[in-house]
């Protein structure tokens, strides 16, 4: 009889040397091959003989080593959720969604199932950049110095104050974190006592 | 021990039906995969129709729409259920499971008018 | 449907000789999935090589498969008065599963 270094093999203890890859399989005491991505399990192992497996049909995936004896069902992004999709749906892979922009993800369940609309950052504020879009609601924070955003938006970004001088202008009025510099043209007229020389 | 048992078998004429039964024993029907294969006489094997494990079934070109395989829980049971029989229906009816590891002694289906 | 080949038809051989069956697909066999079985008069099949290469336990090892893609063998060393019979392939890489026609191992 063949040496056991591939399953099937006996297991004692309930475990297996491939956790990933293989399965202890309890009717019979042995530790079996997991289907790879993409597939499942057509024929489970038995005493005399290994797991067969077989692809998953189109508009169905299994996405890990697996001893399931079906796929999973591809499901679409559901627009209504607030989700779009990012990467179709393959054998190995479930459909990527994310939430549609100007939207946060509100329910999560190992993946995102609902989004709702970010809330509006009053002026004066922005959102306060996430490392993942959609991941949760805005977080307003205020404009940093020299900084100003004049409207209610979920997505709107404090801009910099203009500076009057880049544009040959003077300052009228400074800029505050809702409103944005007020420049004006200079003065043309002398200073009066420059006029009087002027006239003699 | 696994032990697979064929019966239905028999003499039919063109055009009719028949079911054939497996009885299995040592195993879980239900759970595994299951196939059918024939032999005509004198001839070579032949893939009938096979259930797997998920319940997906399949079947060959030959039989395909005529022939319905399935499996009774209760019983431990696989069926082929065979309607519009033909003269090159004729054969030993194999019963094998789990996968192709255990064969039943098979069951003659004659077609015959 | 993958069509499966064997040859030779039959092959004439001597006890304690060995020798290599051949069992050609029409296209590459998914995942080498490929059984040979051995049927002998009067009896049922027996599975006794899977996955083109793995052994059924129980199966003496003077069986052994081997091939990928379209091409696979399975060769008896030291061959035994009870090896003499008909041997066959199978692909089961598809949900059509074919067998090829066969292969009788004579007495010389």
């Known amino acids: 009889s063949q040496p056991q270094a591939v399953p099937p093999y006996a297991s004692e203890n309930q475990t297996c040397r491939d956790q990933e890859k293989e399965y202890y399989e309890p009717q019979h005491r042995i530790c079996c091959s997991r289907c790879p991505p993409g597939t499942y399990v057509s024929a489970k192992c038995s005493r005399i003989r290994d797991t067969v497996c077989a692809t998953c049909a189109e508009n169905s995936y299994n996405e890990h080593w697996n001893y399931l004896t079906i796929c999973q069902l591809c499901r679409p992004c559901d627009p209504v959720m607030g989700l779009e999709e990012i990467a179709p749906c393959t054998s190995k892979r479930k459909t990527q969604c994310r939430c549609q922009p100007g939207m946060f993800c509100a329910a999560w369940a190992l993946e995102c199932t609902h989004c709702e609309l970010l809330s509006d950052c009053p002026p004066g504020t922005e959102a306060e950049l996430k490392d993942e879009v959609g991941k949760g609601n805005n977080h307003c924070v205020p404009c940093k110095a020299g900084h100003f955003q004049n409207t209610s938006s979920p997505s709107a970004r404090c801009q910099p104050h203009t500076r009057c001088e880049n544009q040959g202008l003077v300052e009228a009025a400074p800029g505050t974190a809702q409103s944005d510099t007020t420049c004006k043209n200079p003065l043309e007229p002398l200073p009066p006592e420059m006029s009087g020389t002027m006239l003699m | 021990e696994v032990q697979l048992v064929e019966s239905g078998g028999g003499l039919i004429q063109p055009g009719g039906s028949l079911r054939l039964s497996c009885a299995a024993s040592?195993?879980?029907?239900?759970?595994?995969?299951m196939s059918w294969v024939r032999q005509a006489p004198g001839k070579g094997l032949e893939w009938v129709s096979v259930i797997y494990s998920g319940g997906n079934t399949y079947y060959g070109d030959s039989v395909k729409g005529r022939f319905t395989i399935s499996r009774d829980n209760s019983k431990n049971t696989l069926y082929l259920q065979m309607n519009s029989l033909r003269a090159e229906d004729t054969a030993v009816y194999f019963c094998?499971?789990?996968?192709?590891?255990?064969w039943g002694p098979g069951t003659l289906v004659t077609v015959s008018s | 449907e993958i069509v499966l080949t064997q040859f030779p038809g039959t092959l004439s051989l001597s006890p304690g000789e060995g020798g290599t069956l051949s069992c050609r697909a029409s296209q590459t066999v998914w995942s080498n999935y490929l059984a040979w079985y051995q049927q002998k008069p009067g009896q049922a099949p027996r599975l006794l090589i899977y996955?083109?290469?793995r052994r059924v336990i129980g199966i003496p090892d003077r069986f052994s498969g081997s091939g990928s893609g379209t091409d696979f063998n399975l060769t008896i060393s030291s061959l035994e008065p009870g090896d003499f019979a008909v041997y066959y392939c199978?692909?089961?890489?598809?949900?059509?599963?074919?067998f090829g026609q066969g292969t009788r191992l004579e007495i010389k």
């Open positions: 996955g083109a290469s």
């Open positions: 199978q692909q089961y890489g598809s949900s059509s599963i074919t």
């Open positions: 040592g195993f879980t029907v239900s759970d595994n995969y």
């Open positions: 094998t499971g789990p996968f192709f590891d255990y």
